[in-house]
Interface confidence: low
């Protein structure tokens, strides 16, 4: 997170830290005791699928305070439409091997109904993004969980206000832009997969997933987030379905 | 909201509770009556939550500890009586006044619903948690705000 602040301990209780072979991989969002939402691109280069760990209740990576809960990731489900190395359909649903215990420091974020997300949450201007990613483009990652308030843009406004770059990916209907184009604040590498959380009348909801951008906090560019509202039925159907064998599963979308 | 308090034993009230901070027991001594003490204490200990006139559209306000209740006129509903129960009450208009989810119905009024772990309150629009850790709430802030003493 570039230009954010420390999320005080316990105030981002749905934030997940994903580790592979003990190393920081990505962020994620707890949506109930056994399921985590993250970004598909986080898993592009994974070889040791059995060494994926999700940590809940984490705050400061440099210390263990007893509120952390670690779980093996039993399954990673990615939409069949996602192509590794690209940006569209950048979503993954992770099943934990064992459920986490909900505590003051471990709480799920609400996965909203689609219509509510599309016609109400999408028009809440500011939302919070969080993670332990880089504090500057090509800079060091954070030890304490960082959080940033970002404004959401309509896609046409995002395109009009963004500097044109020859090989820039399209902003599809499965994404949205949020943040600042003045180079001051953005999510960054290492925050991928983490939550874009929107507050409405006293409750927080998952509206986006940290996905991609032209560098981080680059002048003339906004952060791009996976538009979670497009995947609600897909996520709900998968969470209701019987477990399948294998760690990586490509599930048909829509 | 509490004009009668000003008349009641003004000398001792000024001395005990306004010039200095008084306890519930000291207030009880002044008022000699549990119900009146409670009314005074709610306003005194954390401010009159009705002072900002939160109830809209002619609704009346009752002060509570760190909160308030609005009693709405028949044509209005919602925490602050802000929602009209009329033809405009559809989900595309301000989420139909619902705190969480809203469903439109042909020929009848829209209905509000709540996420798993919440249930709909009697006002028909608000949701209250039914589990210890409902989604989308931050326990350390919820607890802090619920127990936080108000400064004066």
């Amino acid at each position: 997170i570039v230009g954010g602040k420390v999320c005080p301990k316990g105030e981002c209780p749905w934030q997940v830290l994903l580790l592979v072979n003990g190393a920081q991989l990505c962020g994620g969002t707890l949506i109930n005791t056994i399921w985590v939402v993250s970004a598909a691109h986080c898993f592009d280069k994974i070889k040791n699928w059995r060494n994926l760990i999700a940590v809940l209740g984490e705050h400061d990576l440099s210390e263990h305070d007893g509120d952390e809960q670690s779980r093996r990731v039993a399954q990673v489900i990615i939409p069949s439409t996602y192509v590794p190395g690209t940006t569209n359909h950048d979503i993954a649903l992770l099943r934990l091997h064992q459920p986490v215990v909900l505590t003051d420091h471990v709480v799920p974020l609400c996965l909203p109904e689609r219509t509510f997300s599309e016609r109400t949450l999408a028009f809440v201007r500011f939302s919070l993004v969080s993670g332990w990613g880089q504090l500057l483009d090509r800079g060091a990652t954070a030890l304490e969980l960082m959080v940033l308030n970002v404004p959401r843009l309509m896609t046409q406004d995002c395109l009009q206000q963004s500097r044109k770059v020859g090989d820039s990916p399209n902003i599809t209907e499965y994404m949205f832009c949020a943040g600042y184009s003045d180079g001051s604040k953005d999510s960054c590498k290492g925050d991928s997969g983490g939550p874009h959380a929107t507050h409405y009348r006293g409750t927080w909801y998952l509206t986006g997933i940290v996905s991609w951008g032209q560098g981080c906090a680059t002048v003339g560019h906004f952060g791009v987030y996976t538009r979670v509202s497009q995947y609600i039925e897909w996520l709900q159907k998968l969470m209701r379905s019987e477990p399948r064998p294998g760690v990586l599963l490509r599930a048909p979308f829509p | 909201a509490n004009a009668f308090l000003e008349e009641l034993r003004p000398g001792s009230l000024e001395r005990e509770c306004k010039e200095e901070q008084c306890s519930f027991e000291e207030a009880r001594e002044i008022f000699k009556d549990a119900e009146r003490t409670k009314l005074f204490w709610i306003s005194y200990s954390d401010g009159d939550q009705c002072a900002s006139s939160p109830c809209q559209n002619g609704g009346s306000c009752k002060d509570q500890l760190q909160s308030y209740i609005c009693f709405c006129l028949p044509a209005f509903e919602g925490r602050n009586c802000e929602t009209h129960k009329d033809d405009q009450l559809i989900c595309v208009n301000e989420n139909g006044g619902c705190e969480q989810y809203c469903s439109d119905h042909t020929g009848t009024k829209r209905s509000c619903r709540c996420h798993e772990g919440y249930s709909l309150l009697a006002d028909g629009v608000s949701c209250t948690p039914t589990v210890e850790y409902p989604c989308g709430k931050i326990p350390i802030l919820e607890k802090r705000n619920a127990s936080k003493p108000q400064g004066r």
Partner: antibody, heavy 122, light 107 residues
């Protein structure tokens, strides 16, 4: 009732370190809130120096960051300010303060100490 | 950093009159703006938080409005104890910043 009381020397020599302590009564410093230092040069406006959050994390004003350290001693229910390499420009009334930081940003300062005057002079 | 510009610098009014104090932010800060009152020799006192929410114990004659970059503090009918310096504060972005103040003096 929350009360904050600043203490420390009223006179500091240039280039030395200014050290102030804020003692909090009526409230546990480790239970919540951001505990801040704010200063006011004579006849001027208010300047936020920095805060220490109840969890121990700090945030400082970039204009002073290289010279400021704010720490907490939960056993004494105190938090402290150290400002190094002081000059006459650091002469001010220094306030310690508490703000309840709800989710996102807020930092409305609801509780203040009465302030302590510090003069930097040789 | 966010710069807050308060106007007027000095406002001379009599008890019973209405006072309108302005605070302008150099960039949008939503409703994260707070108002304080300071009297000589005293610490500031929080009056209004989040643009329009009165702090505990603040008389109803004090009210706040605005959003984004333009904010107003209104005192509907001045009492003798209302004279002093009023500061607005940005609570949106670090560093937290204050306006230079508006001195409300007795005419």
């Amino acid at each position: 009732q929350v009360q904050l009381q600043e203490s420390g020397p009223g006179l500091v020599k240039p280039s030395q370190t200014l050290s102030l302590t804020c003692t909090v009564s009526g409230y546990s410093i480790s239970s919540d809130s951001a505990w801040s230092w704010i200063r006011q040069p004579p006849g001027k406006g208010l300047e936020w120096i920095g805060y220490i959050y109840y969890s121990g994390s700090t945030n400082y004003n970039p204009s002073l960051k290289s010279r400021v350290t704010i720490s907490v001693d939960t056993s004494k229910n105190q938090f402290s300010l150290k400002l190094s390499s002081v000059t006459a420009a650091d002469t001010a009334v220094y306030y310690c303060a508490r703000s309840v930081n709800y989710y996102g940003n807020s930092f409305a300062v609801g509780y203040w100490g009465q302030g302590t005057s510090v003069t930097v002079s040789s | 950093e966010i710069v807050l510009t308060q106007s007027p610098a000095t406002l001379s009014l009599s008890p019973g009159e209405r006072a309108t104090l302005s605070c302008r932010a150099s960039q949008g800060i939503s409703d994260y703006l707070h108002w304080y009152q300071q009297k000589p020799g005293e610490a500031p006192r929080l009056l209004i938080k989040y643009t329009s929410q009165p702090a505990t114990g603040i008389p109803a004659r004090f009210s706040g409005s605005g959003s984004g970059t333009d904010f107003t503090l209104t005192i509907s009918s001045l009492e003798p104890e209302d004279f002093g310096v009023y500061y607005c504060q940005n609570g949106h972005s670090f560093p937290l910043t204050f306006g230079a103040g508006t001195k409300l003096e007795l005419k």
